[in-house]
Amino acid sequence: MAVTACQGLGFVVSLIGIAGIIAATCMDQWSTQDLYNNPVTAVFNYQGLWRSCVRESSGFTECRGYFTLLGLPAMLQAVRALMIVGIVLGAIGLLVSIFALKCIRIGSMEDSAKANMTLTSGIMFIVSGLCAIAGVSVFANMLVTNFWMSTANMYTGMGGMVQTVQTRYTFGAALFVGWVAGGLTLIGGVMMCIACRGLAPEETNYKAVSYHASGHSVAYKPGGFKASTGFGSNTKNKKIYDGGARTEDEVQSYPSKHDYV
């Protein structure tokens, strides 16, 4: 039950994360005009990965696409690439994880196959989240660099009589959406990987539990605490039988094949 919940939650969290990555990629407000310490302009500039926009105080907003590939900064191209890779990986991960969900039955698919698919989608989500975080962080770094460069220009280029309004850009809403979305996708991916461990049939643990079942002297120790089997912690030895989760002790109360030897 816990495995199904972890897998389901991982899927939902990743789904929200990828939706956020798509939203961030499409948003126009990656960088917005810095209004602090600036004369109050009647136009507000903001830029996205695909177009730049100007909102006039009149109420009119004009957006212009970047209709060039070669003329764009390499960093912007890199950010675009990272975000697209993140979206593609995330979309594939979602597709894989749908079939991997324990609550969905597809023919006679074995648990091992579902476990592999869960792990695959988990890794895809992790990489997708990292791509988004990296893309947003690269853009943010680019903004910080440009911000301080334009600030320096502001104070050095004031020798003449005529002043020029230097437009500086700061973090836009899309950056925060991207960071959060990337983080959610990453968390979702980790949850899927954790769920995969619970889905995979652990042969050694099963045998270990069965083997110790005949040794009634080691089933309980004075004081009432459970004895360890020697194969990792007790939590790892929680197995699923007949569709229900049972502890080591519960398993021992059922006849095992070794009891009749």
Partner: antibody
Framework: QVQLQQSGAELARPGASVKLSCKAS????????MSWVKQRTGQGLQWIGE????????HYNEKFKGKATLTADKSSSTVYMQLSSLTSEDSAVYFC???????????WGQGTLVTVPA | DIVMTQSPSPLTVTAGEKATMSCKSS????????????LTWYQQKPGQPPKLLIY???TRESGVPDRFTGSGSGTDFSLTISSVQAEDLAVYYC?????????FGSGTKLEIK
């Protein structure tokens, strides 16, 4: 077509207040901002401030802060400007003007003459 | 506040001649975001409200005769009337539409000989 109909001429005594109106028609009232412009007889134009009918947000020229108050009524598509503590310096023609591309004013009211005797 | 300086005033020309008036701003009106200059030209005839001629420094408003041309960038702008007609007798104002408060020039009065 876009039309801005302003209220009639006002004669006010010094220290009093007047409220001028500008009724808009022929376009979606909440889409464009509305400005008020002052013109004293034989003189140039002075921008007073602007209001966004959608939100009610305003921008004022510092020179007119405390003197002019802009409001908008979406239900009647009307913008108002209240002028307070009137002096002879406030005697002028006041225009309402609807914003357009480039923050320019493409549509103007016919103007309201406010007279404050010295 | 941005100071808009217009010259000459008055501007006297013969009908059919070219008239050019200048407008200088104390700060650049160029917006780097869209590379547009936020300067507007108006024509005002006696007893009438101003009429929009040119916005974004060079974009002619629809219905305005093509003899009116706006040009310039940054801080220096001009309005040219290629062939002055009798009905062009008016005061011409330039306006800063970029930085609050919006400011107008003192106007150039066009007179016909």
């Amino acid at each position: 077509q876009v039309q801005l109909q302003q209220s009639g001429a006002e004669l006010a005594r010094p220290g009093a207040s007047v409220k001028l109106s500008c009724k808009a028609s022929g376009y979606t009232f909440t889409v464009w901002s509305m400005s008020w412009v002052k013109q004293r007889t034989g003189q140039g134009l002075q921008w007073i401030g602007e209001i966004y009918p959608k939100s009610g947000n305003t921008h004022y020229n510092e020179k007119f802060k405390g003197k002019a108050t802009l409001t908008a009524d979406k239900s009647s598509s009307t913008v108002y400007m209240q002028l307070s503590s009137l002096t002879s310096e406030d005697s002028a023609v006041y225009f309402c003007a609807r914003a357009y591309y480039g923050n320019s004013f493409a549509y103007w009211g016919q103007g309201t003459l406010v007279t404050v005797p010295a | 506040d941005i100071v808009m300086t217009q010259s000459p005033s008055p501007l006297t020309v013969t009908a059919g001649e070219k008239a050019t008036m200048s407008c200088k701003s104390s700060q650049s009106l160029l917006n780097s975001g869209n590379q547009r200059n936020y300067l507007t030209w108006y024509q005002q005839k006696p007893g009438q409200p101003p009429k929009l001629l040119i916005y974004w420094a060079s974009t002619r408003e629809s219905g305005v005769p093509d003899r009116f041309t706006g040009s310039g960038s940054g801080t220096d702008f001009s309005l040219t009337i290629s062939s002055v007609q009798a009905e062009d007798l008016a005061v011409y104002y330039c306006q800063n539409d970029f930085i609050y408060p919006f400011t107008f020039g003192s106007g150039t009065k066009l007179e016909i000989k």
